[in-house]
């Protein structure tokens, strides 16, 4: 038997993936656990094996279909259960009625690229990945730029309050190496959270021309 407090948190990527993390204070001795997803009106269900990510937490990804297929909508409720093997049978360790579009976390933006770079500015574009058509333009972005001698945590956040998949960074220092990251969030959903940060994009501003400032 397992005692202790348990936390079970899941997010829907808006297309075909539900990612879950289960934390349990009490020790689990080499027990096999899984997450089972049972939609309220769909003719499919799905299971994933929970794998340890720390001493007392486990994670797994429910792959519901092809990455860009719309497997759930705003009308769906999915019963999510954590099941752990106890002898010959499975014991329900945690359960929640999951509303996918109230618990969104999109995939990190991809395909970051420098469109145009100058001495003091840089235009960068990106794409969103596996985002539902339901959002239309109802997305927002946060971006940050890593300057030399600073950490990501120190980088000021730039907020784009609309679906804008580019940014023009200004007031940069000439001939300097920077890194840039962006993340995305739908406006919909009570428990919706930011996507992970994108992979950093490294770029270098152009050196200042001798004798004049560009």
């Amino acid at each position: 038997a397992v005692n202790g407090t348990s936390q079970f948190t899941c997010f829907y990527n808006s297309r075909a993936n539900i990612s879950c993390v289960w934390s349990q204070d009490g020790a689990l001795q080499d027990t096999s656990c899984q997450v089972h997803a049972w939609p309220d009106r769909r003719r499919w269900n799905q299971t994933c094996e929970l794998l340890p990510v720390s001493q007392a937490s486990w994670a797994c990804n429910l792959i519901l279909g092809a990455p860009d297929s719309q497997k759930l909508t705003t009308v769906d409720i999915v019963t999510l259960r954590v099941l752990c093997r106890e002898g010959v049978r499975w014991r329900v360790m945690a359960i929640q009625d999951f509303k996918p579009f109230e618990n969104l976390r999109l995939m990190a933006p991809i395909s970051l690229q420098v469109v145009h770079v100058e001495t003091h500015r840089c235009n960068i574009s990106w794409e969103i990945s596996q985002a539902s058509h339901y959002f239309e333009r109802h997305l927002e972005f946060e971006a940050r730029t890593l300057s030399p001698g600073h950490t990501w945590e120190e980088a000021p956040l730039l907020t784009l309050k609309q679906k804008q998949e580019w940014i023009c960074l200004e007031t940069l220092t000439p001939d300097t190496q920077y890194e840039f990251q962006v993340r995305v969030k739908p406006l919909q959903g009570e428990f919706t959270t930011w996507s992970p940060w994108s992979q950093p994009l490294a770029f270098r501003t152009k050196p200042a021309a001798l004798g004049k400032d560009t």
Epitope: D40, R41, S69, V75, Y134
Partner: antibody
Framework: QVQLVQSGAEVKKPGASVKVSCKAS????????IEWVRQAPGQGLEWMGE????????NHNEKFQGRVTMTRDTSTSTVYMELSSLRSEDTAVYYC?????????WGQGTTVTVSS | DIQMTQSPSSLSASVGDRVTITCKAS??????VAWYQQKPGKAPKSLIY???YRYSGVPSRFSGSGSGTDFTLTISSLQPEDFATYFC?????????FGQGTKLEIK
């Protein structure tokens, strides 16, 4: 096998209410949404709303908001749909149907005639 | 509300014919589309869900396809019992809505 059996035909006067029943059998009653769909004579299908018997959760078509009431009795595996303030345009066949994949099993229909 | 526009509204065909009915959604509905068959005085019968999945017991001559806004129901070789009215439906978002129907008649 899955079956949805509805109550018999009704004749009502304008302004009255009608309550149609739908008794389910052959599956776990609490687990699946029951939908209500109506069809006026010679017309298409119109979704009215749905109820999840296990929790009692309800979603309505806003067109019927305030006039339609959906309830369930888990002891008899029966769902009810009551439509109030009836008018002549509510004359239709009313169907209950289970939502699993889409609307997979249908009741036989209940004819409601609204006439003065 | 999402409008489902079916075409044609009526169709005359012969036994053995291949018939295609189309349905256009006013917004993207993914693959959350179903097809139903209805005969006079009877309740609708489910044929297809999720745009292309046949319910068990539905003959293989019935097939569905499409995603986004454009959907089709195809009957590969019409049988006498297939003459009926066919409805498409979206269940992607509330309120769920149906097409106006396609009446398939014997030529």
């Amino acid at each position: 096998q899955v079956q949805l059996v509805q109550s018999g035909a009704e004749v009502k006067k304008p302004g009255a209410s009608v309550k149609v029943s739908c008794k389910a059998s052959g599956y776990t009653f609490s687990r699946y949404w029951i939908e209500w769909v109506r069809q006026a004579p010679g017309q298409g299908l119109e979704w009215m709303g749905e109820i999840l018997p296990g929790s009692g959760s309800i979603n309505h078509n806003e067109k019927f908001q305030g006039r339609v009431t959906m309830t369930r009795d888990t002891s008899t595996s029966t769902v009810y749909m009551e439509l109030s303030s009836l008018r002549s345009e509510d004359t239709a066949v009313y169907y209950c149907t289970r939502h699993y994949g889409s609307f997979d099993y249908w009741g036989q229909g209940t004819t409601v005639t609204v006439s003065s | 509300d999402i409008q489902m526009t079916q075409s044609p509204s009526s169709l005359s065909a012969s036994v053995g014919d291949r018939v295609t009915i189309t349905c256009k959604a006013s917004q993207n509905v993914g693959t959350d589309v179903a097809w139903y068959q209805q005969k006079p005085g009877k309740a609708p019968k489910s044929l297809i869900y999720s745009a292309s999945y046949r319910y068990s017991g539905v003959p293989s001559r019935f097939s569905g396809s499409g995603s986004g806004t454009d959907f089709t129901l195809t009957i590969s070789s019409l049988q006498p019992e297939d003459f009926a009215t066919y409805f498409c439906q979206q269940y992607s978002s509330y309120p769920f809505t149906f097409g106006q129907g396609t009446k398939l008649e014997i030529k």
